[in-house]
């Protein structure tokens, strides 16, 4: 069987939701010694990067300028060490935002609720769209989808304090072209043991995967990489 290197990791730097006309940055994290990285878009070659020097860095960044709907879609990457190619990375969905209009988001029964109450978000956009998306700040990968002609409902069911936080919604013209984001709506949920005092909202952190962790190799890392490569060959 044909030998392949382990698949790389593809990430969007800062966010996979890129405003139109802004630059998107995708990182492909492969291995030290990789001489070439290829970025594929919708299955076709999109860009090539050759790290310098290849043995000292474990990945590359691909800059996609002037984001638009034609550049939004599914990206993957591969890398090469010598003549040996890696498996293809997982697919990354790159979305263009700030297309056309801005929806409005509201929360029912209100922005302050108690644990156990049923909460519904409503996203409304009067221009032609049929898909709506709801995102929680710091959880941008957990996208909820709902459908409707000019508005969509996002029933959350009985909420807990884990639902605290800021939410935004988008109208979607296709899977990869989204509207401007709505103004954020902050949901405050008080727990059963609290009385009228409001608990603070949970801190929201940026999505941990929306960071490019490309590292330059130290002597120790080089030894470890060499040992790992030898061990893999022995296993084969």
């Amino acid at each position: 069987p044909k030998q392949t290197l382990p698949k790389p990791i593809i990430r969007a730097e800062s966010t996979y939701m890129v405003p139109k006309e802004k630059q998107a940055t995708l990182c492909c994290q492969g291995s030290y010694g990789a001489v070439e990285y290829q970025l594929h878009f919708e299955g076709s070659l999109f860009a090539v990067e050759r790290p310098k020097p290849p043995e000292r860095i474990n990945g590359v960044k691909f800059h996609i300028p002037d984001m638009n709907s034609r550049k939004a879609g599914r990206y993957s990457c591969i890398y090469r060490v010598g003549e040996l190619w890696s498996e293809r990375s997982d697919l990354l969905d790159l979305v263009v935002t700030e297309m056309y209009d801005t929806p409005t988001l509201s929360v029912h029964p209100g922005p302050e609720v108690t644990s156990g109450e049923k909460v519904t978000f409503y996203c409304r956009l009067d221009t032609a769209t049929s898909m709506f998306l709801l995102l929680k700040e710091g959880r941008s990968r957990d996208v909820q989808r709902s459908y409707g002609k000019v508005q969509a409902e996002f029933p959350m069911g009985p909420v807990t304090t884990a639902h605290r936080g800021s939410y935004r919604c988008f109208g979607s013209y296709n899977n990869y072209a989204w509207s401007f984001p709505s103004e954020p709506v902050k949901l405050l949920v008080t727990g059963d043991i609290e009385n009228t005092s409001l608990a603070p909202t949970d801190p929201t952190f940026p999505d941990s995967w929306d960071t490019c962790l490309l590292t330059r190799e130290t002597g120790l890392q080089k030894d470890l990489a060499l040992w790992d490569h030898t061990a893999q060959n022995l296993l084969r």
């Epitope: 988001l105 509201s106 029964p109 302050e112 409503y122 009228t196």
Partner: antibody, heavy 117, light 107 residues
Framework: QVQLQQPGAELVKPGASVKLSCKAS?????SYWMHWVKLRPGQGFEW???????????NYNEKFKRKATLTVDKSSSTAYMQLSSLTSEDSAVYYC??????????WGQGTSVTVSA | DIVMTQSQKFMSTSVGDRVSVTCKAS??????VAWYQQKPGQSPKALIY???FRYSGVPDRFTGSGSGTDFTLTISNVQSEDLAEYFC?????????FGSGTKLEIK
């Protein structure tokens, strides 16, 4: 402080329509659902419906769907309820009320609607 | 629709007494029940939300309890200013519904 101002009374003829107003102040008008409630002497309170001013989404009590229409004017922070085809059954006090925290915690003074020829 | 039944239309009590106003829901409403007080010629005032949580500024002699279908508003050490009508409301499901009210009379 939060205030919901409603006119005191409206006298209307049977079959006519009336548009009740509720001017809000002291809070972010667009962020909270405005509810309308009907009170008839000896009948108790009936929830008519609610509207969120930010995007005009409404929820109605099925019983009032053909009777009441809720709207808002964001520029003046005013909510409206139009009642159509009025009969003596519609004679009541109508309250606008909002839920800022957990229940209907602020109420207008109510508008007394009298349907009479 | 969920029917909220307040079986006692009137309750008579004396200053300093303890009185319990009851409300029964026709189906389970969890703890999504509020209690309101309406004094003659005034608009309703919210006292309790989520069955047992008091609004700030509401005296601690007002307490709410219950869950599911049976709910109680208890006023301990009744004061003359508590002369009013009390009614419950469920906000668990549409349409929101109210009890018919219980008038508290002070002897």
């Amino acid at each position: 402080q939060v205030q919901l101002q409603q006119p005191g009374a409206e006298l209307v003829k049977p079959g006519a329509s009336v548009k009740l107003s509720c001017k809000a102040s002291g809070y972010t008008f667009t962020s909270y659902w405005m509810h309308w409630v009907k009170l008839r002497p000896g009948q108790g309170f009936e929830w008519i419906g609610e509207i969120i001013p930010s995007n005009g989404v409404t929820n109605y009590n099925e019983k009032f769907k053909r009777k009441a229409t809720l709207t808002v004017d964001k520029s003046s922070s005013t909510a409206y309820m139009q009642l159509s085809s009025l009969t003596s059954e519609d004679s009541a006090v109508y309250y606008c009320t909002i839920r800022l925290r957990y229940a209907l915690d602020y109420w207008g003074q109510g508008t007394s609607v009298t349907v009479s020829a | 629709d969920i029917v909220m039944t307040q079986s006692q239309k009137f309750m008579s009590t004396s200053v300093g007494d303890r009185v319990s106003v009851t409300c029964k829901a026709s189906q389970n409403v969890g703890t999504n029940v509020a209690w309101y007080q309406q004094k003659p010629g005034q608009s309703p005032k919210a006292l309790i939300y989520s069955t047992s949580f008091r609004y700030s500024g509401v005296p601690d002699r007002f307490t709410g309890s219950g869950s599911g279908t049976d709910f109680t508003l208890t006023i301990s050490n009744v004061q003359s200013e508590d002369l009013a009508e009390y009614f419950c409301q469920q906000y668990n499901s549409y349409p929101f519904t109210f009890g018919s009210g219980t008038k508290l009379e002070i002897k």
